[in-house]
Amino acid sequence: DYKDDDDKGWVWEPLFVTEEETSTMPMYVGQLKSDLDKEDGSLQYILTGEGADSIFFINEHGKIYVRQKLDREKKSFYILRAQVINRKTRHPIEPDSEFIIKVRDINDHEPQFLDGPYVATVPEMSPEGTSVTQVTATDGDDPSYGNNARLLYSLIQGQPYFSVEPKTGVIRMTSQMDRETKDQYLVVIQAKDMVGQAGAFSATATVTINLSDVNDNKPIFKESLYRLTVSESAPTGTSIGTIMAYDNDIGENAEMDYSIEEDDSQTFDIITNHETQEGIVILKKKVDFEHQNHYGIRAKVKNHHVPEQLMKYHTEASTTFIKIQVEDVDEPPVFTLESYVMEIAEGVVSGSLVGTVSARDLDNDDSSVRYSIVQGLHLKRLFSINEHNGTIITTEPLDREKASWHNITVTATETRNPEKISEANVYIQVLDVNDHAPEFSKYYETFVCENAVPGQLIQNISAVDKDDSAENHRFYFSLAQATNSSHFTVKDNQDNTAGIFTAGSGFSRKEQFYFFLPILILDNGSPPLTSTNTLTVTVCDCDTEVNTLYCRYGAFLYSIGLSTE
């Protein structure tokens, strides 16, 4: 421990001062000596440099003393310069030499944890040996000398879950831990100097270890059975109730999705409210109490996010059973048909049966209904209904030729709840009866010229019948017996028309101005009806070409003349 730059004349010994030394001061440190020193008092030793005189001094024999207690942690060595001179001549005997006085360490410092408080986070269920964090203590003592600053770490609190590596201070997990059982641990670590030997100092640090969540829990329904009700009047899309599962995980690891596992009726759906983490049971199809009054569905719940490595915790989804009761809504009676079509022959006596309507109270098979006819303000009441059994009868004979169809509205009212009323339309067709004889289809103006020849067609006639004209409806035409048959003939064309022909010639206006032909028209109804229709034939003065237009004009003037006489 000396520095000898130029000369080997200096005799050194290692110079140390033990810090914090409390023996009597001044205290001998060591000897400074030149090999030229004959110890006759002729040489003088001079000390300069750090702490010379104030901390260290040297006597005439070259003995160095320390005046006061030293602290290595404040200053661990002092650099001094030694001179030796001839006391008389004041000339150096040796070259100046620099040397060091080291302050020897004693264990006077406790270890210190400077980075606290320590907080660490590690995922739950991490495997044994997982590094959690590292704690490091410092010691003011000399790390290069002895064991004063050599630290050993140990666990004071935290077994059996954690361990600490003695030399490094690395904290590790010693078992898999479940956050859902305990989510925070306080670990106390001790750092001891002197490698744990006697007289060692120690310090402790508390490490707060938080377990972060992993998705190691599947959601589980709170109830194995849920009971919900839905009104049969509820529209599709109605929320009929909620179901709820719990998940011991937190955050996104607890986010869940509900779904239908089993619903053969395909009547319901389940959606997830991600804010409340509830499952909402939704009506997908309308329900009908009278068709089915309860339903059973099975719902399941799964986590939204499950990493592949955690799937082992989610093998079988939790399920629950939901009993859904349909609530009866008192509905109006239901007619067997939305509208009825009935028929009745025209002319039948009043009180004749037209048909029957029927309605029933679906809410109660035993409950009776009351029937009635909605009367129009201006309609004549042609029908009545039996309020108990729904039979409709006529109140007077019907005439198809006045109205071939009647439209009435019938109502059915629940006897136990008269507010519940339903309606049905009844269309009544009046069937034709052959109760009208045929007649001329129009008024005919028929003329015959005085110079007409036999066999001349003077008029085509057709007939109409107020009865229903069926496809095979036929009219037959003939002259009524023994009337003017010598002057005219009727030829039936077999197509519901007939021709009137002259039978002879020599018509004279002077002799007979008009002929009245009674024509018999017969229909093919059942029973057939006939009528006699009179055709008036006017005789007129015609030109040579038998021009009836001229004739008509003449006849017209003549008729005026007749009427004024």
Epitope: S224, L225, R227, T229, D264, S265, E290, H291, Q292, N293, H294, Y295, G296, F321, K323, Q325, E327
Partner: antibody, heavy 119, light 107 residues
Framework: QVQLVESGGGVVQPGRSLRLSCAAS????????MHWVRQAPGKGLEWVAV????????YYADSVKGRFTISRDTSKNTLYLQMNSLRAEDTAVYYC????????????WGQGTLVSVSS | EIVLTQSPGTLSLSPGERATLSCRAS???????LAWYHQRPGQAPRLLIY???SRATGIPDRFSGSGSGTDFALTISSLEPEDFAVYYC????????FGQGTKVEIK
């Protein structure tokens, strides 16, 4: 073990009333829907009425609607059937039955009580 | 209401024989909501099968149920003396109705 014991049956004149009781034990009465079923002498089974586990809903067969009332007293673990305006055709053995928790079938039945309506 | 028709009305068989009972619904029974009961003389009915094919607690495996929609069956693979009784099917899709019963008697 689950037990259902009916009582209150007897002979009654047409038009009169009768109240049947069914004492339940061996299970959590308040968790189950309960029913009455009857069986006319020598005939088959006929469902009569049901009441929900919490007593809020009741349903009846059309044949008894408006005349019979089903009720329950959870504090006494007892089911009731109030029968009014009795008719001859109401003559039967009346059974109370428990509805299965996860189903609508009847997993436990009482031994029945006979109601005879005659003048 | 859903009407259940059971056939045959009576079944005469010997112990050890196989029994097949039929139950037909007037309209489709949703979600196989059908149960079978048996009733011995003077006793209350006892649940055998629910959900058309699931055996109730304590029911021996010689009893099995099958079917869906409108046609259901109860099969007793080998009749035991205590199996001779009246068997009822019940639907619980729409309210609750029972069949008229099938009597299984000793031949």
């Amino acid at each position: 073990q689950v037990q259902l014991v009916e009582s209150g049956g007897g002979v009654v004149q047409p038009g009169r009333s009768l109240r049947l009781s069914c004492a339940a034990s061996g299970f959590t009465f308040s968790s189950y829907d309960m029913h009455w079923v009857r069986q006319a002498p020598g005939k088959g089974l006929e469902w009569v009425a049901v009441i929900s586990y919490d007593g809020t809903n009741e349903y009846y067969a059309d044949s008894v609607k408006g005349r019979f009332t089903i009720s329950r007293d959870t504090s006494k673990n007892t089911l009731y059937l109030q029968m009014n305006s009795l008719r001859a055709e109401d003559t039967a053995v009346y059974y109370c039955a428990r509805e299965r928790y996860f189903d609508w079938s009847f997993d436990y039945w009482g031994q029945g009580t006979l109601v005879s309506v005659s003048s | 209401e859903i009407v259940l028709t059971q056939s045959p009305g009576t079944l005469s068989l010997s112990p050890g024989e196989r029994a097949t009972l039929s139950c037909r619904a007037s309209q489709s029974v949703s979600n196989t909501y059908l149960a079978w009961y048996h009733q011995r003389p003077g006793q209350a009915p006892r649940l055998l099968i629910y959900g058309a094919s699931s055996r109730a607690t304590g029911i021996p495996d010689r009893f099995s149920g099958s079917g869906s929609g409108t046609d259901f069956a109860l099969t007793i693979s080998s009749l035991e003396p205590e199996d001779f009784a009246v068997y009822y099917c019940q639907q619980y899709s729409n309210s609750w109705t029972f069949g008229q019963g099938t009597k299984v008697e000793i031949k």
